[in-house]
Interface confidence: low
């Protein structure tokens, strides 16, 4: 049975946020093998997945997970009650909202039940491991003839999030991005009425309520403006220009087509 687990790409740098301990042993045996690192992410403070690479074990092993909160009222050791599986082997644990205490030090312990001395403990700051859901309900409205305002919602305490807005027109090679603080709105002061704009937003649990490094997924994009660019030759010309730029980077001396030239070609 393959279970898909929602975890972001990339490793959280938790060197300052946890330590690993392995119980000592007298002889070289399986108990000296290091246990895989546990990675935890709190999804929108609704649930938390703590996962490990089960395939790193020399033989298939159903590792067990225990957890508690250090120096708090919740310091009683708890067993994982909802394991996640990969190829029918435990590869994670899911904790529900009531078991998540963001501002207490979370201690997670992985253990090999066949070798009880083989265990590893990590301490995590959960407020730095929150990943919000993607922003929703993106809306655009005109503030003036040339100014647009983008608004959005988050299914979380907006106060705790910062945001990154990206936008581009159909003529652009890349996104332009702008950081936005906890107030979920963004203004674009100068809009070209002849172009079609695409906007998207992502959010992060930072800096007010935590210092998370991971962003949410991007929102569904929202569009504004003329659709005509989709059918005109300008995009083809831009692609050609991009090829020329690439070739120039490789040492060619081709003349680049300027945007002004492209407009000229397009209108004639």
């Amino acid at each position: 049975l393959n279970t898909t687990i929602l975890t972001p790409n990339g490793n959280e740098d938790t060197t300052a946020d946890f330590f690993l301990t392995t119980m000592p042993t007298d002889s070289l045996s399986v108990s000296t093998l290091p246990l895989p690192e546990v990675q935890c992410f709190v999804f929108n403070v609704e649930y938390m997945n703590c996962t490990w690479n089960s395939s790193s074990e020399p033989q298939p092993t159903n590792l067990t997970l225990h957890y508690w909160y250090k120096n708090s009222d919740n310091d009683k050791v708890q067993k994982c009650s909802h394991y996640l599986f990969s190829e029918e082997i435990t590869s994670g644990c899911q904790l529900q909202k009531k078991e998540i205490h963001l501002y207490q030090t979370f201690v997670v312990q992985l253990q090999d039940p066949r070798e009880p001395r083989r265990q590893a403990t990590q301490m995590l700051k959960l407020q730095n491991l929150v990943i919000p859901w993607a922003p929703e309900n993106l809306t655009l409205h005109k503030l003036s003839e040339s100014q647009l305002e983008l608004n959005w919602n988050n299914r979380f305490l907006n106060h705790c999030l910062e945001h990154l807005v990206q936008y581009r027109t159909d003529w652009d090679h890349s996104w332009t991005e702008q950081s936005v603080d906890y107030r979920h709105k963004f203004s674009l002061p100068s809009v070209d009425g002849q172009k079609r704009y695409t906007f998207r937003v992502r959010s992060r649990f930072n800096p007010l309520c935590g210092s998370a490094q991971h962003w949410s997924e991007w929102s569904h994009p929202i569009h504004w403006g003329s659709n005509t660019s989709k059918e005109n030759p300008f995009l083809f010309a831009l692609e050609a220009e991009q090829k020329l730029i690439s070739e120039e980077d490789l040492g060619g001396e081709q003349k680049l087509i300027s945007e002004e030239d492209l407009h000229h070609h397009h209108h004639h």
Epitope: L157, H159, C160, Y182, R183, P207, L208, S211
Partner: antibody, heavy 114, light 107 residues
């Protein structure tokens, strides 16, 4: 231990200048927006300035705009407030605080008097 | 600028009393409001952020509610260490502004 420590307060004559410093420790300074807030003797709190994480964006209250400027050195975990053209009404305890006030410095008293 | 008006400005109460302080905003500030406690000679201490979220380490007898233009801070059972001044602050619009404060005194 997470803390902010201000320094640089003192007595200054009207029209004079003063530079306040705020040293941060115990947290990743460049992850946080920072603010300056002041409190005149026996009065309430007044927000006066804000600076973004990278230090590229600043906002000021009208009462200090054009006279005060804030900057930060993330490499040194420090924040500063340069106060010029000081007036008697600038007399107050000045606090630096982490963005929305979860961590405050102990405050430093600035007295503007001839 | 957004004006915040706190009521009352002074409040006399006894240990064990339930105390409510109100903060009115001159325009809608959504939930972008925080509450602080300040004792003489000390820096303010954050109690509540986002109108109703209890700051870590703050006793659960403190609670906040409201959104839009009317907000309240409630102390369910006043303790001796709660005699202090309380301020609301809005973070919805620049410039950020504070209420004038409420001083809670021993009756």
């Amino acid at each position: 231990q997470v803390q902010l420590v201000e320094s640089g307060g003192g007595l200054v004559k009207p029209g004079g200048s003063l530079r306040l410093s705020c040293e941060a420790s115990g947290f990743t300074f460049n992850d946080f927006y920072m603010t300056w807030i002041r409190q005149a003797p026996g009065k309430g709190l007044e927000w006066i300035a804000y600076i973004s994480k990278s230090g590229d964006k600043m906002r000021y209250a009208d009462s200090v705009k054009g006279r005060f400027s804030t900057s930060r050195d993330n490499a040194k975990n420090s924040l500063s407030l340069q106060m010029n053209s000081l007036r008697a009404e600038d007399t107050a305890v000045y606090y630096c605080a982490r963005f929305y006030g979860d961590i405050w410095g102990q405050g430093t008293l600035v007295t503007v008097s001839s | 600028d957004i004006q915040l008006t706190q009521s009352p400005s002074f409040l006399s109460a006894s240990v064990g009393d339930r105390v409510t302080i109100t903060c009115w905003a001159s325009q809608d500030i959504s939930s972008f409001l925080v509450w602080y406690q300040q004792k003489p000679g000390k820096a303010p201490n954050l109690l509540i952020y986002a109108a109703s979220a209890l700051q870590s380490g703050v006793p659960s007898r403190f609670s906040g509610s409201g959104s839009g233009t009317e907000f309240t801070l409630t102390i369910s059972s006043l303790q001796p260490e709660d005699f202090a001044s309380y301020y609301c602050e809005q973070l919805n619009n620049y410039p950020w502004t504070f209420g004038q404060g409420t001083k809670v005194e021993i009756k």
